[in-house]
Interface confidence: low
């Protein structure tokens, strides 16, 4: 299985209630040696990998904040975060989210989801999402929270910046065109009259007159602008999907390790002749 | 529609074995436990085993295990069930069904329309 | 084989009340297991009545009920009518045996 954020990034008004969401996608074990914990905590965008420094929500470990498979009943302290403006919830088909009730400013951060897949007490394997939290402060900043991809943005402005500059070219073209033309105009004027010059002082001597026009000073030079293609191209940031504890993991992880299922091994596809 | 289409009903000799095909359709096949239930004529339902399409990993309860094969082609979204070594005992409909969450020990909520399966010298 | 016991019919006039009972061990319902039940309608295939316990999927009527205690489970049907005529089994994980157990089947009978 994998997990996955459907949001990355969360603005919300001071005051309101913030509800992050993760979702598992593939079937997950929960065999008889086989936990899954699900939890949460704050951290803070690291540079080679998010998620690494673990942070209490509002003063509650990620110990206190596990969800609860649907066939366990849930421990005493699973309800004191209740108590501070937190709730977990999940459904059967891989959602899990934590709401943050009434939020303010120092709730602001970057909250990570953790599922860790433990086979008898080992961890086995450990999946991360992550998103950011922004609370606006003042009454007055909107009255509800809007959540996005700031992936989405980032390919947004992108190709806004694209198209922006596809447009200023097309309209500075004309204007260009004509100040080349006035610029060859006044070149061709100022030609003419060197070789009425020059046809009154040495009679016969020809000018071969070099149409080399001098640069004109106003024209940007290519370079300082990266070609279109590159702006279109940029890559959105990962912003911590399908990250995995080991940074050099592959972003899709391998299969779970698994169900009620602890010991066989992995069973390769049957053969397609064998469809019926 | 989501739906499970399972192969036609079988008759078969004591000590051969039969296959089961069970063809989904109508969700990600991968996402979701697929299981095998029998039920022997006016008798009640038996769980039989389940197997992970997302990686092909099987669990059987105990009264199969040796004799029960269970794979899956997800390219053709389709999971086989292998019952070895039949007996008259064995006579019965077999049901795939998909599970309905992806936790452990939730429902099943589609089933096949169920196979005949009888076993006869 | 069965680890969940029912008992083997029921039956009620339309309109009626009837309860079906389905009795575990601590190894299955009174781990914390989910318990679901199916309705399976003379030659077809079983459907999910109730899953987890006491919810009802989209389309089962809310005449269908069901409850969980330490290592019980039951079924209840209000306002009988004749299409409830049909098997109904209880089914959970057992945590020993390590698979899923059904109940022995109750059989609904609609009186009248």
């Known amino acids: 299985f994998k997990v996955t954020t459907p949001y990355s990034l969360y603005v919300c008004p001071e005051g309101q209630n913030a509800t992050l969401t993760c979702r598992i996608l593939g079937p997950v074990s929960k065999g008889h040696d086989v936990t899954i914990y699900k939890t949460w905590y704050l951290s803070s965008r690291g540079e080679v990998q998010m998620c690494k420094e673990h942070r209490p929500i509002r003063n509650f470990t990620l110990q206190h904040l596990q969800h609860h498979g649907s066939h366990l009943k849930a421990n005493a302290s699973h309800d004191q975060p209740q108590k501070h403006g937190l709730e977990l919830a999940s459904d059967h088909h891989g959602n899990f989210s934590i709401t943050l009730r009434n939020v303010t400013p120092r709730d602001s951060g970057l909250y990570c989801c953790l599922v860790i897949e433990l086979k008898n007490h080992h961890p086995e394997q450990r999946f991360y999402g992550s998103m950011e939290l922004q609370v606006q402060a003042g009454k007055g900043s909107g009255s509800t929270c809007m959540a996005s991809n700031e992936q989405d943005s980032d390919s947004i402005t992108a190709a806004a910046l694209a198209t922006g500059a596809c447009i200023v070219g097309i309209l500075c073209l004309p204007l260009i065109l004509l100040l080349v033309y006035k610029q060859r105009q006044v070149a061709s004027h100022r030609r003419a009259q060197e070789l009425v010059r020059m046809d009154s002082n040495t009679q016969g001597i020809e000018n071969p007159g070099f149409e080399t026009t001098p640069p004109f000073q106003g024209m940007p030079e290519a370079k300082t602008r990266p070609p279109l293609s590159y702006v279109a191209q940029r890559q959105p940031s990962e912003s911590g999907r399908y990250l995995l504890s080991d940074p050099s993991t592959p972003l899709s992880p391998p299969g779970p390790g698994d169900v009620f299922f602890p010991s066989l091994d992995p069973v390769p596809d049957s053969p397609n002749s064998e469809a019926i | 529609q989501v739906q499970l289409v399972e192969s036609g009903a079988e008759v078969k000799k004591p000590g051969a074995s039969v296959k089961v095909s069970c063809k989904a359709s109508?969700?990600?096949?991968?996402?979701?436990?697929m299981h095998w239930v029998r039920q022997a004529p006016g008798q009640g339902l038996e769980w039989m085993g389940v197997?992970?399409?997302?990686?092909?990993?099987?669990s059987f309860a105990q009264k199969f295990q040796g004799r029960l094969t269970v794979t899956r082609d997800t390219s053709t979204s389709t999971a086989y069930m292998d019952l070895s070594g039949l007996r008259s005992e064995d006579t019965a409909v077999y049901y795939c069904?998909?599970?309905?969450?992806?936790?452990?020990?939730?429902?099943?909520?589609?089933w096949g329309q169920g196979t005949m399966v009888t076993v006869s010298s | 084989q069965f680890v969940l016991t029912q008992p083997s019919s029921v039956s009620g006039a339309p309109g009626q009340r009837v309860i079906i009972s389905c009795t575990g061990s601590?190894?299955?319902?009174?781990?914390?297991?989910?318990v679901h039940w199916y309705q399976q309608l003379p030659g077809t295939a079983p459907k999910v009545l109730i899953y987890?316990?006491?919810d009802r999927p989209s389309g089962v009527p809310d005449r269908f009920s069901a409850s969980k205690s330490a290592t019980s489970a039951s079924l209840a049907i209000t306002g009988l009518q004749a299409e409830d005529e049909a098997d109904y089994y209880c089914?959970?994980?057992?945590?020993?045996?390590?698979?899923?157990?059904f109940g022995t089947g109750t059989k609904v009978t609609v009186l009248g």
């Open positions: 601590s190894s299955n319902i009174g781990a914390g297991y989910d």
């Open positions: 109508g969700y990600i096949f991968t996402d979701y436990y």
């Open positions: 987890g316990n006491s």
């Open positions: 197997i992970n399409p997302y990686d092909g990993r099987t």
């Open positions: 069904a998909k599970q309905m969450g992806i936790w452990d020990y939730d429902a099943f909520d589609i």
């Open positions: 089914v959970a994980w057992d945590d020993s045996l390590k698979a899923y157990v």
